[in-house]
Interface confidence: low
Protein backbone atom coordinates (compact mmCIF):
# COMPACT_ATOMS: atom_id res chain seq x y z
CA UNK A 1 0.00 0.00 0.00
CA UNK A 2 1.17 3.53 -0.72
CA UNK A 3 1.74 6.22 1.90
CA UNK A 4 -1.64 7.65 2.94
CA UNK A 5 -2.17 10.54 5.36
CA UNK A 6 -4.73 10.12 8.12
CA UNK A 7 -8.15 11.74 8.40
CA UNK A 8 -8.79 13.10 11.89
CA UNK A 9 -12.27 13.33 13.41
CA UNK A 10 -13.19 14.93 16.74
CA UNK A 11 -15.34 12.89 19.12
CA UNK A 12 -17.44 14.98 21.50
CA UNK A 13 -20.10 13.40 23.71
CA UNK A 14 -23.53 14.64 24.67
CA UNK A 15 -24.76 14.74 28.28
CA UNK A 16 -24.95 10.93 28.54
CA UNK A 17 -21.18 10.55 28.68
CA UNK A 18 -20.70 13.30 31.26
CA UNK A 19 -20.25 11.62 34.66
CA UNK A 20 -18.85 12.77 37.99
CA UNK A 21 -18.20 16.27 36.58
CA UNK A 22 -15.81 14.76 34.05
CA UNK A 23 -16.12 14.56 30.29
CA UNK A 24 -14.27 12.24 27.91
CA UNK A 25 -13.25 13.66 24.56
CA UNK A 26 -11.83 11.62 21.73
CA UNK A 27 -9.94 11.77 18.47
CA UNK A 28 -10.37 9.22 15.69
CA UNK A 29 -7.34 8.89 13.40
CA UNK A 30 -8.50 6.99 10.33
CA UNK A 31 -7.15 5.59 7.09
CA UNK A 32 -3.38 6.05 7.30
CA UNK A 33 -0.40 4.03 6.15
CA UNK A 34 2.23 3.13 7.26
CA UNK A 35 2.51 3.16 11.04
CA UNK A 36 3.15 5.07 13.26
CA UNK A 37 1.14 8.15 14.17
CA UNK A 38 1.58 10.12 17.36
CA UNK A 39 -1.34 11.68 19.20
CA UNK A 40 -0.88 14.34 21.85
CA UNK A 41 -3.39 16.60 23.57
CA UNK A 42 -2.87 20.37 23.73
CA UNK A 43 0.64 19.82 22.34
CA UNK A 44 1.53 17.57 25.27
CA UNK A 45 0.35 19.85 28.07
CA UNK A 46 -2.63 17.54 28.69
CA UNK A 47 -1.10 14.20 29.62
CA UNK A 48 -3.12 12.81 32.52
CA UNK A 49 -6.27 10.94 31.65
CA UNK A 50 -5.01 10.20 28.12
CA UNK A 51 -5.61 6.77 26.55
CA UNK A 52 -4.31 6.02 23.05
CA UNK A 53 -5.58 2.69 21.78
CA UNK A 54 -3.62 0.32 19.52
CA UNK A 55 -4.02 0.77 15.78
CA UNK A 56 -6.23 -1.60 13.82
CA UNK A 57 -5.35 -2.59 10.23
CA UNK A 58 -8.34 -2.66 7.88
CA UNK A 59 -8.24 -2.70 4.04
CA UNK A 60 -4.48 -1.96 4.10
CA UNK A 61 -5.03 1.20 6.18
CA UNK A 62 -4.63 1.79 9.91
CA UNK A 63 -7.12 3.40 12.32
CA UNK A 64 -6.61 4.31 15.92
CA UNK A 65 -8.31 6.41 18.55
CA UNK A 66 -7.18 8.44 21.53
CA UNK A 67 -9.22 9.85 24.41
CA UNK A 68 -8.70 12.35 27.19
CA UNK A 69 -10.83 12.89 30.29
CA UNK A 70 -11.13 16.48 31.51
CA UNK A 71 -13.32 18.27 34.08
CA UNK A 72 -16.65 19.25 32.51
CA UNK A 73 -17.72 21.79 35.14
CA UNK A 74 -16.33 24.30 35.51
CA UNK A 75 -15.28 24.27 31.84
CA UNK A 76 -11.55 24.31 31.16
CA UNK A 77 -10.61 27.85 30.18
CA UNK A 78 -8.36 26.53 27.42
CA UNK A 79 -9.74 24.65 24.44
CA UNK A 80 -8.93 20.98 24.05
CA UNK A 81 -6.98 20.14 20.89
CA UNK A 82 -5.81 16.79 19.68
CA UNK A 83 -2.51 16.91 17.75
CA UNK A 84 -1.88 14.16 15.24
CA UNK A 85 1.43 13.64 13.45
CA UNK A 86 2.08 11.12 10.68
CA UNK A 87 5.80 11.34 9.82
CA UNK A 88 5.59 9.08 6.75
CA UNK A 89 3.28 11.52 4.91
CA UNK A 90 4.67 14.64 6.66
CA UNK A 91 1.16 15.32 7.95
CA UNK A 92 0.31 17.29 11.08
CA UNK A 93 -3.33 17.89 12.01
CA UNK A 94 -4.63 19.83 15.00
CA UNK A 95 -8.31 19.21 15.77
CA UNK A 96 -10.14 21.40 18.26
CA UNK A 97 -12.76 19.50 20.25
CA UNK A 98 -15.70 21.37 21.75
CA UNK A 99 -17.81 19.45 24.29
CA UNK A 100 -21.50 19.86 23.47
CA UNK A 101 -23.43 21.17 26.43
CA UNK A 102 -26.71 19.31 26.48
CA UNK A 103 -27.11 19.38 30.25
CA UNK A 104 -29.98 21.84 30.62
CA UNK A 105 -33.40 20.48 29.60
CA UNK A 106 -35.00 23.54 27.88
CA UNK A 107 -31.93 24.09 25.69
CA UNK A 108 -31.81 22.76 22.16
CA UNK A 109 -28.67 20.79 21.54
CA UNK A 110 -27.17 22.18 18.34
CA UNK A 111 -24.86 19.64 16.79
CA UNK A 112 -21.67 20.97 15.17
CA UNK A 113 -22.66 21.57 11.56
CA UNK A 114 -21.53 19.24 8.84
CA UNK A 115 -20.53 20.86 5.58
CA UNK A 116 -23.10 20.61 2.81
CA UNK A 117 -22.14 19.71 -0.76
CA UNK A 118 -24.20 20.74 -3.77
CA UNK A 119 -23.67 19.97 -7.44
CA UNK A 120 -25.07 22.28 -10.11
CA UNK A 121 -25.69 21.62 -13.80
CA UNK A 122 -24.23 23.79 -16.55
CA UNK A 123 -26.25 26.76 -17.78
CA UNK A 124 -28.46 25.70 -20.71
CA UNK A 125 -27.08 28.59 -22.78
CA UNK A 126 -23.50 27.39 -22.26
CA UNK A 127 -24.43 23.83 -23.27
CA UNK A 128 -26.17 24.96 -26.46
CA UNK A 129 -23.72 27.64 -27.60
CA UNK A 130 -20.58 26.21 -29.18
CA UNK A 131 -18.52 29.32 -28.39
CA UNK A 132 -19.30 29.07 -24.65
CA UNK A 133 -17.90 26.57 -22.15
CA UNK A 134 -20.40 24.60 -20.08
CA UNK A 135 -19.29 23.84 -16.53
CA UNK A 136 -20.56 21.50 -13.83
CA UNK A 137 -20.09 23.17 -10.45
CA UNK A 138 -19.52 21.61 -7.05
CA UNK A 139 -19.97 23.87 -4.01
CA UNK A 140 -19.08 23.01 -0.41
CA UNK A 141 -20.67 25.35 2.12
CA UNK A 142 -20.52 25.61 5.91
CA UNK A 143 -16.84 24.69 6.17
CA UNK A 144 -15.50 25.44 9.63
CA UNK A 145 -12.52 27.76 10.06
CA UNK A 146 -10.56 24.94 11.73
CA UNK A 147 -11.28 22.40 9.00
CA UNK A 148 -8.43 21.60 6.62
CA UNK A 149 -8.81 22.30 2.91
CA UNK A 150 -11.30 20.16 1.02
CA UNK A 151 -10.11 18.10 -1.93
CA UNK A 152 -12.29 17.75 -5.02
CA UNK A 153 -12.17 14.76 -7.36
CA UNK A 154 -14.20 14.69 -10.57
CA UNK A 155 -15.42 11.72 -12.58
CA UNK A 156 -17.13 11.53 -15.98
CA UNK A 157 -18.96 8.19 -16.29
CA UNK A 158 -16.75 6.96 -13.41
CA UNK A 159 -13.51 7.90 -15.20
CA UNK A 160 -11.49 10.38 -13.14
CA UNK A 161 -10.69 13.66 -14.90
CA UNK A 162 -8.23 16.34 -13.81
CA UNK A 163 -9.38 19.44 -15.69
CA UNK A 164 -11.39 21.07 -12.90
CA UNK A 165 -10.67 24.59 -11.72
CA UNK A 166 -10.87 24.81 -7.94
CA UNK A 167 -11.00 28.25 -6.38
CA UNK A 168 -9.29 28.99 -3.06
CA UNK A 169 -11.75 28.69 -0.22
CA UNK A 170 -13.58 31.90 0.54
CA UNK A 171 -14.59 33.20 3.96
CA UNK A 172 -18.24 34.08 4.49
CA UNK A 173 -19.36 36.83 6.82
CA UNK A 174 -20.81 34.20 9.20
CA UNK A 175 -17.27 32.87 9.85
CA UNK A 176 -17.74 29.75 7.75
CA UNK A 177 -16.01 29.08 4.45
CA UNK A 178 -17.18 27.93 1.05
CA UNK A 179 -15.18 26.15 -1.59
CA UNK A 180 -16.07 25.91 -5.28
CA UNK A 181 -14.79 23.60 -8.00
CA UNK A 182 -15.85 23.95 -11.63
CA UNK A 183 -15.40 21.23 -14.22
CA UNK A 184 -15.42 22.49 -17.83
CA UNK A 185 -17.19 19.85 -19.87
CA UNK A 186 -17.78 18.96 -23.52
CA UNK A 187 -21.13 20.13 -24.87
CA UNK A 188 -21.88 16.69 -26.30
CA UNK A 189 -20.95 14.88 -23.08
CA UNK A 190 -23.78 16.68 -21.29
CA UNK A 191 -26.24 16.34 -24.17
CA UNK A 192 -25.44 12.63 -24.50
CA UNK A 193 -26.36 12.07 -20.85
CA UNK A 194 -22.94 11.35 -19.37
CA UNK A 195 -22.81 11.30 -15.58
CA UNK A 196 -20.68 13.84 -13.71
CA UNK A 197 -19.59 13.03 -10.19
CA UNK A 198 -17.98 15.35 -7.69
CA UNK A 199 -16.24 13.68 -4.73
CA UNK A 200 -15.33 15.92 -1.83
CA UNK A 201 -12.86 14.75 0.76
CA UNK A 202 -11.71 16.43 3.93
CA UNK A 203 -10.28 15.42 7.26
CA UNK A 204 -13.44 17.04 8.67
CA UNK A 205 -15.73 14.49 6.99
CA UNK A 206 -16.28 10.97 8.35
CA UNK A 207 -16.22 9.76 4.72
CA UNK A 208 -15.95 11.39 1.28
CA UNK A 209 -19.17 13.06 0.10
CA UNK A 210 -20.20 12.28 -3.47
CA UNK A 211 -22.74 14.15 -5.59
CA UNK A 212 -23.74 13.12 -9.11
CA UNK A 213 -25.58 14.97 -11.85
CA UNK A 214 -26.56 14.35 -15.46
CA UNK A 215 -29.01 15.67 -18.02
CA UNK A 216 -32.66 14.80 -17.42
CA UNK A 217 -33.30 11.48 -19.10
CA UNK A 218 -35.87 11.29 -21.88
CA UNK A 219 -36.26 12.12 -25.55
CA UNK A 220 -35.81 15.85 -26.31
CA UNK A 221 -38.87 17.63 -27.69
CA UNK A 222 -38.56 20.98 -29.44
CA UNK A 223 -40.60 23.90 -28.10
CA UNK A 224 -43.27 25.73 -30.05
CA UNK A 225 -42.67 29.49 -29.81
CA UNK A 226 -45.43 32.10 -30.09
CA UNK A 227 -45.21 35.87 -29.65
CA UNK A 228 -48.18 37.85 -28.37
CA UNK A 229 -48.46 41.64 -28.80
CA UNK A 230 -49.63 43.90 -25.95
CA UNK A 231 -53.36 43.64 -25.20
CA UNK A 232 -55.45 46.56 -26.47
CA UNK A 233 -56.44 47.47 -22.88
CA UNK A 234 -52.78 48.06 -21.95
CA UNK A 235 -52.25 50.73 -24.63
CA UNK A 236 -53.55 53.39 -22.23
CA UNK A 237 -50.42 52.90 -20.08
CA UNK A 238 -46.85 54.20 -20.52
CA UNK A 239 -45.42 50.68 -20.56
CA UNK A 240 -46.72 47.70 -22.46
CA UNK A 241 -45.98 43.98 -22.21
CA UNK A 242 -44.89 41.73 -25.04
CA UNK A 243 -45.31 38.04 -24.33
CA UNK A 244 -43.45 35.02 -25.60
CA UNK A 245 -45.10 31.66 -25.02
CA UNK A 246 -42.80 28.66 -25.27
CA UNK A 247 -44.68 25.38 -25.08
CA UNK A 248 -44.40 21.59 -25.21
CA UNK A 249 -40.66 21.13 -24.72
CA UNK A 250 -38.55 18.53 -22.94
CA UNK A 251 -36.28 18.52 -20.95
CA UNK A 252 -36.90 21.66 -18.91
CA UNK A 253 -33.44 23.19 -19.56
CA UNK A 254 -34.16 26.24 -21.71
CA UNK A 255 -32.89 29.76 -22.27
CA UNK A 256 -35.29 32.53 -23.26
CA UNK A 257 -33.98 36.00 -24.06
CA UNK A 258 -35.24 39.10 -25.85
CA UNK A 259 -33.61 41.40 -28.40
CA UNK A 260 -34.72 44.88 -29.36
CA UNK A 261 -33.69 45.93 -32.88
CA UNK A 262 -31.00 43.25 -32.71
CA UNK A 263 -29.59 44.36 -29.34
CA UNK A 264 -30.09 42.36 -26.09
CA UNK A 265 -33.07 43.61 -24.10
CA UNK A 266 -32.86 43.67 -20.31
CA UNK A 267 -36.32 44.36 -18.95
CA UNK A 268 -37.82 40.87 -19.20
CA UNK A 269 -38.84 38.14 -16.80
CA UNK A 270 -39.27 34.42 -17.44
CA UNK A 271 -41.42 32.03 -15.47
CA UNK A 272 -39.80 28.85 -14.24
CA UNK A 273 -40.51 25.87 -16.52
CA UNK A 274 -43.96 24.52 -15.60
CA UNK A 275 -44.85 20.89 -16.26
CA UNK A 276 -47.81 20.01 -18.47
CA UNK A 277 -49.92 16.96 -17.72
CA UNK A 278 -48.07 15.05 -20.47
CA UNK A 279 -44.67 15.63 -18.84
CA UNK A 280 -43.54 18.35 -21.25
CA UNK A 281 -42.89 21.90 -20.05
CA UNK A 282 -43.95 25.44 -20.89
CA UNK A 283 -42.58 28.87 -20.08
CA UNK A 284 -43.84 32.41 -20.45
CA UNK A 285 -41.53 35.36 -20.95
CA UNK A 286 -42.72 38.94 -20.54
CA UNK A 287 -40.85 41.93 -21.92
CA UNK A 288 -41.85 45.36 -20.64
CA UNK A 289 -41.24 48.21 -23.10
CA UNK A 290 -42.11 51.88 -23.31
CA UNK A 291 -45.32 52.29 -25.32
CA UNK A 292 -43.54 54.88 -27.49
CA UNK A 293 -40.86 52.28 -28.42
CA UNK A 294 -43.55 49.80 -29.35
CA UNK A 295 -45.57 52.31 -31.37
CA UNK A 296 -42.43 53.48 -33.20
CA UNK A 297 -42.42 50.13 -35.00
CA UNK A 298 -39.27 48.72 -33.39
CA UNK A 299 -38.72 44.99 -33.80
CA UNK A 300 -38.69 42.86 -30.65
CA UNK A 301 -37.41 39.30 -30.89
CA UNK A 302 -37.98 36.40 -28.51
CA UNK A 303 -34.93 34.13 -28.78
CA UNK A 304 -35.08 30.53 -27.52
CA UNK A 305 -32.28 28.02 -26.95
CA UNK A 306 -33.26 24.39 -26.45
CA UNK A 307 -31.58 21.12 -27.36
CA UNK A 308 -34.64 19.85 -29.25
CA UNK A 309 -34.50 22.70 -31.77
CA UNK A 310 -32.73 22.58 -35.13
CA UNK A 311 -29.36 24.26 -34.46
CA UNK A 312 -30.59 24.45 -30.83
CA UNK A 313 -32.05 27.88 -31.58
CA UNK A 314 -35.17 29.60 -32.83
CA UNK A 315 -36.59 33.11 -32.62
CA UNK A 316 -39.85 34.90 -33.24
CA UNK A 317 -40.16 38.63 -33.90
CA UNK A 318 -42.88 41.06 -33.02
CA UNK A 319 -43.45 44.66 -34.13
CA UNK A 320 -46.27 47.14 -34.13
CA UNK A 321 -48.08 47.71 -37.45
CA UNK A 322 -49.32 51.34 -37.44
CA UNK A 323 -53.02 51.68 -38.10
CA UNK A 324 -53.61 47.95 -37.72
CA UNK A 325 -55.02 47.33 -34.23
CA UNK A 326 -56.33 43.81 -34.00
CA UNK A 327 -58.08 42.15 -31.13
CA UNK A 328 -56.65 38.93 -29.75
CA UNK A 329 -59.76 37.24 -31.16
CA UNK A 330 -58.56 38.19 -34.65
CA UNK A 331 -55.16 36.60 -34.20
CA UNK A 332 -56.08 33.40 -36.01
CA UNK A 333 -57.82 35.34 -38.80
CA UNK A 334 -54.77 37.61 -39.00
CA UNK A 335 -52.53 34.56 -39.39
CA UNK A 336 -54.87 33.30 -42.15
CA UNK A 337 -54.88 36.67 -43.88
CA UNK A 338 -51.11 36.87 -43.74
CA UNK A 339 -50.87 33.35 -45.13
CA UNK A 340 -53.22 34.41 -47.94
CA UNK A 341 -51.20 37.57 -48.54
CA UNK A 342 -48.00 35.57 -48.85
CA UNK A 343 -49.69 33.21 -51.30
CA UNK A 344 -50.87 36.17 -53.40
CA UNK A 345 -47.41 37.77 -53.35
CA UNK A 346 -45.78 34.46 -54.33
CA UNK A 347 -48.18 33.94 -57.25
CA UNK A 348 -47.72 37.55 -58.38
CA UNK A 349 -43.92 37.30 -58.30
CA UNK A 350 -44.03 33.93 -60.11
CA UNK A 351 -46.29 35.33 -62.87
CA UNK A 352 -44.17 38.47 -63.13
CA UNK A 353 -40.97 36.43 -63.54
CA UNK A 354 -42.73 34.16 -66.04
CA UNK A 355 -43.85 37.15 -68.12
CA UNK A 356 -40.34 38.64 -68.00
CA UNK A 357 -38.86 35.33 -69.17
CA UNK A 358 -41.51 35.06 -71.90
CA UNK A 359 -40.88 38.63 -73.08
CA UNK A 360 -37.13 38.05 -73.07
CA UNK A 361 -37.51 34.84 -75.07
CA UNK A 362 -39.85 36.48 -77.64
CA UNK A 363 -37.54 39.50 -77.94
CA UNK A 364 -34.50 37.31 -78.49
CA UNK A 365 -36.37 35.27 -81.09
CA UNK A 366 -37.49 38.45 -82.94
CA UNK A 367 -34.00 40.02 -82.83
CA UNK A 368 -32.50 36.81 -84.21
CA UNK A 369 -35.10 36.69 -87.03
CA UNK A 370 -34.61 40.38 -87.99
CA UNK A 371 -30.82 39.98 -87.90
CA UNK A 372 -30.91 36.94 -90.23
CA UNK A 373 -33.28 38.77 -92.62
CA UNK A 374 -30.92 41.77 -92.81
CA UNK A 375 -27.93 39.55 -93.59
CA UNK A 376 -29.82 37.81 -96.41
CA UNK A 377 -30.99 41.16 -97.85
CA UNK A 378 -27.46 42.53 -97.80
CA UNK A 379 -26.14 39.54 -99.77
CA UNK A 380 -28.75 40.07 -102.56
CA UNK A 381 -28.17 43.83 -102.81
CA UNK A 382 -24.35 43.94 -102.99
CA UNK A 383 -23.91 42.64 -106.66
CA UNK A 384 -26.40 45.16 -107.96
CA UNK A 385 -24.39 47.95 -106.39
CA UNK A 386 -21.28 46.62 -108.10
CA UNK A 387 -22.98 46.59 -111.51
CA UNK A 388 -24.22 50.10 -111.03
CA UNK A 389 -20.72 51.28 -110.16
CA UNK A 390 -19.30 49.55 -113.19
CA UNK A 391 -21.84 51.28 -115.50
CA UNK A 392 -21.11 54.77 -114.31
CA UNK A 393 -20.16 57.35 -117.06
Amino acid sequence: AKTTPPSVYPLAPGSAAQTNSMVTLGCLVKGYFPEPVTVTWNSGSLSSGVHTFPAVLQSDLYTLSSSVTVPSSPRPSETVTCNVAHPASSTKVDKKIVPRDCGCKPCICTVPEVSSVFIFPPKPKDVLTITLTPKVTCVVVDISKDDPEVQFSWFVDDVEVHTAQTQPREEQFNSTFRSVSELPIMHQDWLNGKEFKCRVNSAAFPAPIEKTISKTKGRPKAPQVYTIPPPKEQMAKDKVSLTCMITDFFPEDITVEWQWNGQPAENYKNTQPIMNTNGSYFVYSKLNVQKSNWEAGNTFTCSVLHEGLHNHHTEKSLSHSPGLQLDETCAEAQDGELDGLWTTITIFISLFLLSVCYSAAVTLFKVKWIFSSVVELKQTLVPEYKNMIGQAP
Epitope: S116, T271, Q272
Partner: nanobody
Framework: QVQLVESGGGLVQAGGSVRLSCAAS????????MTWVRQAPGKGPEWVSA????????RYAESVKGRFTISRDNAKNMLYLQMNSLKPEDTALYYC???????????????RGQGTLVTVSS
Protein backbone atom coordinates in the same frame (compact mmCIF):
# COMPACT_ATOMS: atom_id res chain seq x y z
CA GLN B 1 -19.38 41.06 0.40
CA VAL B 2 -22.53 38.96 0.38
CA GLN B 3 -24.41 39.22 3.68
CA LEU B 4 -27.63 37.50 4.71
CA VAL B 5 -29.03 38.19 8.18
CA GLU B 6 -32.05 36.26 9.47
CA SER B 7 -34.37 37.40 12.26
CA GLY B 8 -37.80 36.67 13.73
CA GLY B 9 -37.18 33.28 15.33
CA GLY B 10 -38.12 32.39 18.89
CA LEU B 11 -40.23 30.13 21.08
CA VAL B 12 -43.75 29.51 19.80
CA GLN B 13 -46.62 27.23 20.78
CA ALA B 14 -47.66 24.38 18.48
CA GLY B 15 -50.32 25.66 16.10
CA GLY B 16 -48.93 29.19 16.34
CA SER B 17 -47.37 31.41 13.71
CA VAL B 18 -44.08 33.20 13.19
CA ARG B 19 -42.64 35.34 10.40
CA LEU B 20 -38.94 35.09 9.57
CA SER B 21 -37.11 37.87 7.77
CA CYS B 22 -33.82 37.86 5.92
CA ALA B 23 -31.99 41.10 5.11
CA ALA B 24 -29.70 40.80 2.09
CA SER B 25 -26.79 43.02 1.10
CA UNK B 26 -23.59 42.93 -0.95
CA UNK B 27 -25.21 41.72 -4.17
CA UNK B 28 -28.05 42.58 -6.57
CA UNK B 29 -30.83 40.93 -4.58
CA UNK B 30 -33.46 41.21 -7.35
CA UNK B 31 -31.27 39.17 -9.73
CA UNK B 32 -31.16 36.05 -7.57
CA UNK B 33 -33.56 33.29 -6.66
CA MET B 34 -33.62 32.87 -2.87
CA THR B 35 -34.24 29.89 -0.63
CA TRP B 36 -34.96 28.92 2.98
CA VAL B 37 -33.20 25.90 4.47
CA ARG B 38 -33.56 24.53 7.97
CA GLN B 39 -31.46 22.28 10.19
CA ALA B 40 -33.13 20.41 13.02
CA PRO B 41 -31.05 19.34 16.05
CA GLY B 42 -28.82 16.44 15.14
CA LYS B 43 -29.97 16.35 11.51
CA GLY B 44 -28.63 17.52 8.16
CA PRO B 45 -29.87 20.61 6.34
CA GLU B 46 -33.36 20.33 4.80
CA TRP B 47 -34.60 22.52 1.96
CA VAL B 48 -37.82 24.33 2.90
CA SER B 49 -38.84 26.75 0.18
CA ALA B 50 -37.59 28.87 -2.71
CA UNK B 51 -38.71 31.89 -4.70
CA UNK B 52 -37.81 33.29 -8.12
CA UNK B 53 -36.44 36.77 -8.82
CA UNK B 54 -39.80 38.47 -9.35
CA UNK B 55 -41.48 36.72 -6.45
CA UNK B 56 -44.22 35.29 -8.66
CA UNK B 57 -43.06 31.67 -8.60
CA UNK B 58 -42.49 29.69 -5.42
CA ARG B 59 -41.77 26.11 -4.41
CA TYR B 60 -42.14 24.29 -1.11
CA ALA B 61 -41.01 21.05 0.50
CA GLU B 62 -43.90 18.61 0.96
CA SER B 63 -43.52 18.84 4.74
CA VAL B 64 -44.39 22.57 4.81
CA LYS B 65 -46.72 22.92 1.81
CA GLY B 66 -49.92 24.78 2.70
CA ARG B 67 -48.49 26.04 6.01
CA PHE B 68 -45.48 28.15 4.99
CA THR B 69 -45.40 31.07 2.56
CA ILE B 70 -42.23 32.51 1.07
CA SER B 71 -42.19 36.07 -0.25
CA ARG B 72 -39.74 38.85 -1.06
CA ASP B 73 -39.55 42.63 -1.30
CA ASN B 74 -36.93 43.55 -3.91
CA ALA B 75 -37.21 47.26 -3.10
CA LYS B 76 -36.12 46.55 0.49
CA ASN B 77 -33.76 43.60 -0.28
CA MET B 78 -35.80 41.43 2.08
CA LEU B 79 -36.84 37.77 2.01
CA TYR B 80 -39.62 36.45 4.25
CA LEU B 81 -41.00 33.14 5.46
CA GLN B 82 -44.46 33.18 7.01
CA MET B 83 -44.86 30.01 9.08
CA ASN B 84 -48.37 29.03 10.19
CA SER B 85 -49.83 25.96 11.96
CA LEU B 86 -46.41 25.21 13.42
CA LYS B 87 -45.60 21.70 14.64
CA PRO B 88 -42.88 20.54 17.09
CA GLU B 89 -41.06 18.93 14.14
CA ASP B 90 -40.63 22.42 12.64
CA THR B 91 -38.16 23.17 15.45
CA ALA B 92 -34.89 24.04 13.73
CA LEU B 93 -32.36 26.67 12.87
CA TYR B 94 -33.71 28.45 9.76
CA TYR B 95 -31.28 29.87 7.21
CA CYS B 96 -31.95 31.99 4.19
CA UNK B 97 -29.72 31.25 1.22
CA UNK B 98 -28.84 32.81 -2.09
CA UNK B 99 -29.28 30.49 -5.02
CA UNK B 100 -26.40 30.64 -7.51
CA UNK B 101 -27.13 31.75 -11.06
CA UNK B 102 -26.10 28.36 -12.43
CA UNK B 103 -28.69 26.51 -10.40
CA UNK B 104 -32.15 25.17 -10.69
CA UNK B 105 -33.26 26.54 -7.36
CA UNK B 106 -34.34 23.22 -5.89
CA UNK B 107 -30.70 22.26 -5.62
CA UNK B 108 -29.10 24.40 -2.95
CA UNK B 109 -27.44 27.69 -2.10
CA UNK B 110 -24.03 29.26 -2.39
CA UNK B 111 -24.30 31.77 0.46
CA ARG B 112 -26.40 31.63 3.61
CA GLY B 113 -26.88 33.54 6.83
CA GLN B 114 -26.12 32.44 10.39
CA GLY B 115 -29.68 31.34 10.98
CA THR B 116 -32.50 32.12 13.37
CA LEU B 117 -33.77 29.49 15.80
CA VAL B 118 -37.45 28.55 15.83
CA THR B 119 -38.54 26.39 18.76
CA VAL B 120 -42.04 24.93 18.66
CA SER B 121 -43.23 23.65 22.01
CA SER B 122 -46.08 21.18 22.35
Amino acid sequence: QVQLVESGGGLVQAGGSVRLSCAASGFTFSSYYMTWVRQAPGKGPEWVSAINTGGDATRYAESVKGRFTISRDNAKNMLYLQMNSLKPEDTALYYCGRVPGYSDYRQGYDYRGQGTLVTVSS
